[in-house]
Amino acid sequence: LPTSQGVDHKQVQRELGNAVLHLHNPTVLSSSSIEVHWTVDQQSQYIQGYKILYRPSGANHGESDWLVFEVRTPAKNSVVIPDLRKGVNYEIKARPFFNEFQGADSEIKFAKTLEEAPSAPPQGVTVSKNDGNGTAILVSWQPPPEDTQNGMVQEYKVWCLGNETRYHINKTVDGSTFSVVIPFLVPGIRYSVEVAASTGAGSGVKSEPQFIQLDAHGNPVSPEDQVSLAQQISDVVKQP
């Protein structure tokens, strides 16, 4: 290969300009890797390698800087880009280079890494009495941290679990909703409430249980006064 010493720079630029890259549709290999293929219209001695440029695309990512993966083997026409974010749509392009000189960009192609279930729970889960005189509670939360969502959050699952299955209540809301009202809680039953985000790959990590128990008037019982039904029964049994 020629070096930049004693090389006609105009010739380098001209040859790099003629070396048009055609990017094929990328192949998604996993939740964190994408394989990129390309062909060169006109091979040249003045191609030292290829720069594969990629970045997350979409409204919520803005115009982020291009990340660069260098391929320093001119004969090579494919590469696997590793360490990508899960469930993220990427725009990808390629360009040839020779030392500090760079050729024209290929067309841009798009590929989305595979989603995984979120690896962190929703944040800031709160459980409170809902307005009104019924036995309903309001469960609120914030999404998991963005880098743990591992894709687009499609829905949130809420589990409101009493001490027996007949007291269980499950709710599902869409991914843009961050609260849900759960009606008809049974007074005197201690419920644990958990929330998890779900992507297309499934349900993620559940939040730490939050406990709530309503008294006969439908008002929350303070945590130190919360006693399970089983405990109440066992206390009665222990009485002489």
Partner: antibody, heavy 115, light 106 residues
Framework: LQQSGPELVKPGASVKISCKAS????????MNWVKLSHGKSLEWIGD????????TYNQNFRGKATLTVDKSSSTAYMELRSLTSEDSAVYYC????????????WGQGTTITVS | IQMTQTTSSLSASLGDRVTISCRAS??????LNWYQQKPDGTVKLLIY???RLHSGVPSRFSGSGSGTDFSLTISKLEQEDIATYFC?????????FGAGTKLELK
């Protein structure tokens, strides 16, 4: 909960009625069926868990009613077989979260006449 | 569990206080719900867990009782309350209903 229209059927025949759910997540609630007849008031037929198709029947309706769901269309179905005049009634679908919770929404009812 | 509504029909005037009773054949704790069936057949939940008012139900409706004896009260009867009222227990399978009390105008 939107139920299918009235049915006039012959004795010995079968009939399948539907209940289409909208406005909530279909798999979050048990779907129940209730019979309203002049002689016997309201009778709970049974329920189905849309998520997995699990059913629980009132013993009195075992062999008479079969409950199914189609998750893709958020629709519950009840088939009644070997119909007799005793089966002439209004049939309601109704939802609840679990057994101790009330039926908070009901369909408008489907009238079945066996004649 | 058998649910008994002893009064099958009840006549009252607009503005009256009306009480409908329901008895369970065994202790059902507070797992007692009341439903209203209008003449056109539509059914609505009124009261759950004996005394809790379902959202959107007028405050003239109230419920009370525990164990085996329960009642539904309408403090001031209005025209739109003319309907049949059913109690239902949620304590034990199979779920069972009372025979209904039909409320009519005098």
């Amino acid at each position: 909960l939107q139920q299918s229209g009235p049915e006039l059927v012959k004795p010995g025949a079968s009939v399948k009625i539907s209940c289409k759910a909208s406005g909530y997540t279909f798999t979050d609630y048990y779907m129940n069926w209730v019979k309203l007849s002049h002689g016997k008031s309201l009778e709970w037929i049974g329920d189905i868990v849309p998520n997995n198709g699990d059913t629980t029947y009132n013993q009195n309706f075992r062999g008479k009613a079969t409950l199914t769901v189609d998750k893709s269309s958020s629709t519950a179905y009840m088939e009644l077989r070997s119909l007799t005049s005793e089966d002439s009634a209004v049939y309601y679908c109704a939802r609840f979260s679990n057994y101790v919770y009330p039926f908070d929404y009901w369909g408008q009812g489907t009238t079945i006449t066996v004649s | 569990i058998q649910m008994t509504q002893t009064t099958s029909s009840l006549s009252a005037s607009l503005g009256d206080r009306v009480t409908i009773s329901c008895r369970a054949s065994q202790d059902i704790s507070n797992f007692l719900n009341w439903y209203q069936q209008k003449p056109d057949g539509t059914v609505k939940l009124l009261i759950y867990y004996t005394s809790r008012l379902h959202s959107g139900v007028p405050s003239r409706f109230s419920g009370s009782g525990s164990g085996t004896d329960f009642s539904l009260t309408i403090s001031k009867l209005e025209q739109e309350d003319i309907a049949t009222y059913f109690c239902q227990q949620g304590n034990t399978l199979p779920l069972t209903f009372g025979a209904g009390t039909k409320l009519e105008l005098k």
